[in-house]
Interface confidence: medium
Amino acid sequence: AGVFELQIHSFGPGPGPGAPRSPCSARLPCRLFFRVCLKPGLSEEAAESPCALGAALSARGPVYTEQPGAPAPDLPLPDGLLQVPFRDAWPGTFSFIIETWREELGDQIGGPAWSLLARVAGRRRLAAGGPWARDIQRAGAWELRFSYRARCEPPAVGTACTRLCRPRSAPSRCGPGLRPCAPLEDECEAPLVCRAGCSPEHGFCEQPGECRCLEGWTGPLCTVPVSTSSCLSPRGPSSATTGCLVPGPGPCDGNPCANGGSCSETPRSFECTCPRGFYGLRCEVSGVTCADGPCFNGGLCVGGADPDSAYICHCPPGFQGSNCEKRVDRCSLQPCRNGGLCLDLGHALRCRCRAGFAGPRCEHDLDDCAGRACANGGTCVEGGGAHRCSCALGFGGRDCRERADPCAARPCAHGGRCYAHFSGLVCACAPGYMGARCEFPVHPDGASALPAAPPGLRPGDPQRYL
């Protein structure tokens, strides 16, 4: 058991053009309140229960009256947290719907009027006992900033609130076989009451001797991950050893999508594609007009002036779905060639190219020598991510445009002296050496080592290196 806590930080106009009108006016003062609905993200039982994990309603916020001519600011919020208690284990993956409601405080007959200002939804992974997670969601032109966490209620602890803790019986240590309860080091893990061998990470129990599995785990002791990879068919024979899914209905069998929505299976659950005018996890939310702000992620709502006429959301780039609720992962299509990295900027895709490539999709290879000139008789060599020039003697630089000092590399061996020459370099060898680079010692009897000196050159003469 535990509590899911939601802290609303701000609700106001989102960034960008098209700031929404203030929902309140001098003639119609109003105040906000919030509703949160939680569902186990991968759970089949959510089909029967709209908010299977629980729901909560906030207090009403301060009364707000718009200042004439002023843009809609962040609106005053209710005090305190929204708290959704959960009785069973925390599922780890959950779906949320957060609705922002407006309560109009004019002279309505029959009391205040309520209307839905914005609705955001999402799926998240969250371990109980962890820090606050921050989130920003947009609904039409509105932006909601909030934080959430799940915490266990004593004596439960752990990421799923399935382990139990009790105060220490002895001041110094826990009983035999029992560990201290981090982070409550002054408490001890309660004696195991689940079925012997029940996985402490993936199983839990509410009655002594039972072993109930968390989402994604199966087997009598919840030690087998649910997987269809080793089954004969997508829902083949059940086995604690293979870890196949239990035979029976698939996520889309019986179509959990209401109001004519179409169902498609995801790896461990399902997804509904809703007809116009309906949305929600199962297309269960209806009677929505453009005034309700049904288009998420900056989508533009047209039509739908009354609940009987369907609205249409025109989605910005990068989003799809009847309510622009689905982000298109355009980078998953791997549009960048040659190992470029993909950036989805929302309005456009960008490729960050590896060195040696260019173009919108990194499709141009800069490594090519085609059309690339190496000056002064140099030749182009491919490789290494950019063209390279192998320069003729006396030239250097990327394109062989720089005149090189042929003596810079000290080419004359054995103390020979180097002289730059229009056709290259000349080595004046020290006594006892000869050759183009003074590399050959002259034998004491006057004969040189191989190769022999060219005719007409005495050992010790300057050798021209052509």
Partner: antibody, heavy 119, light 107 residues
């Protein structure tokens, strides 16, 4: 001298997560992308993803369906690969490999980290 | 994804003889193929990239050729230290993919 030193062997239970580290030295960490590759026993090498340490932009192999997360700590010149919802078939040697940033993809490799997934 | 197929799976060659390994891609990868050497207890070593460019520090008895879908790694004169498993890898597009490997031994 360029060196990539990886963290030690890990033994994990199915469903758990593992985080492997790769400490780089001998070059400017943020100037070179980092790839992660794994090799299951008797199997071919399998590319998992690449990250640019300068701003953490990454590209993942869709085969891993969101189970892989690549991160970096530039102050420690260290890259990390986290793999969640482990299965027995994730038992493998996991390598980090530096991207040369020119036409050659992976010019220096880590020594590998053995991850064993067993109940 | 591009599938890389290497042949043969293993190869036994006498010292000083030529060893040839082939790699085929299921679609054209232009020249963007790399070859790696894997030895037990050592880090993997890049030998060739872009089909035929020799990585610096690699002996010139290793050479690569080919483009499009068919590529070859040749060791012109096999040395004892060349005993290893060799992998090809396309670096044309993500996801990068590797061949199944060729084990080279001395006959």
């Amino acid at each position: 001298e360029v060196q990539l030193v990886q963290s030690g062997a890990e033994v994990k239970k199915p469903g758990a997560s593992v985080k492997v580290s790769c400490k780089a030295s001998g070059y400017t960490f943020t100037s070179y992308w980092m790839h992660w590759v794994r090799q299951a026993p008797g199997q071919r090498l399998e590319w998992m993803g690449v990250i640019d340490p300068s701003d953490s932009l990454a590209n993942y192999n869709q085969e891993f369906k969101g189970r892989v997360t690549l991160t970096v700590d530039t102050s420690a010149s260290t890259a990390y690969m986290e793999l969640s919802s482990l299965r027995s078939e994730d038992t493998a040697v996991y390598y980090c490999a530096r991207d040369s940033t020119v036409v050659a993809p992976m010019d220096y490799w880590g020594q590998g980290t053995t991850v064993t997934v067993s109940s | 994804d591009i599938v890389m197929t290497q042949s043969p799976d293993s190869l036994a060659v006498s010292l000083g003889e030529r060893a040839t390994i082939n790699c085929r891609a299921t679609k054209s990868i232009s020249k963007y193929l790399a070859w790696y050497q894997q030895k037990p207890g050592q880090t993997n070593k890049l030998l060739i990239f872009s089909g035929s460019t020799l990585q610096s520090g690699v002996p010139d008895r290793f050479s690569g050729s080919g483009s499009g879908t068919d590529f070859t790694l040749t060791i012109s004169s096999l040395q004892a230290e060349d005993v290893a498993v060799y992998y090809c890898q396309q670096h044309h597009e993500y996801p990068y993919t590797f061949g199944g490997g060729t084990k080279v031994e001395i006959k």
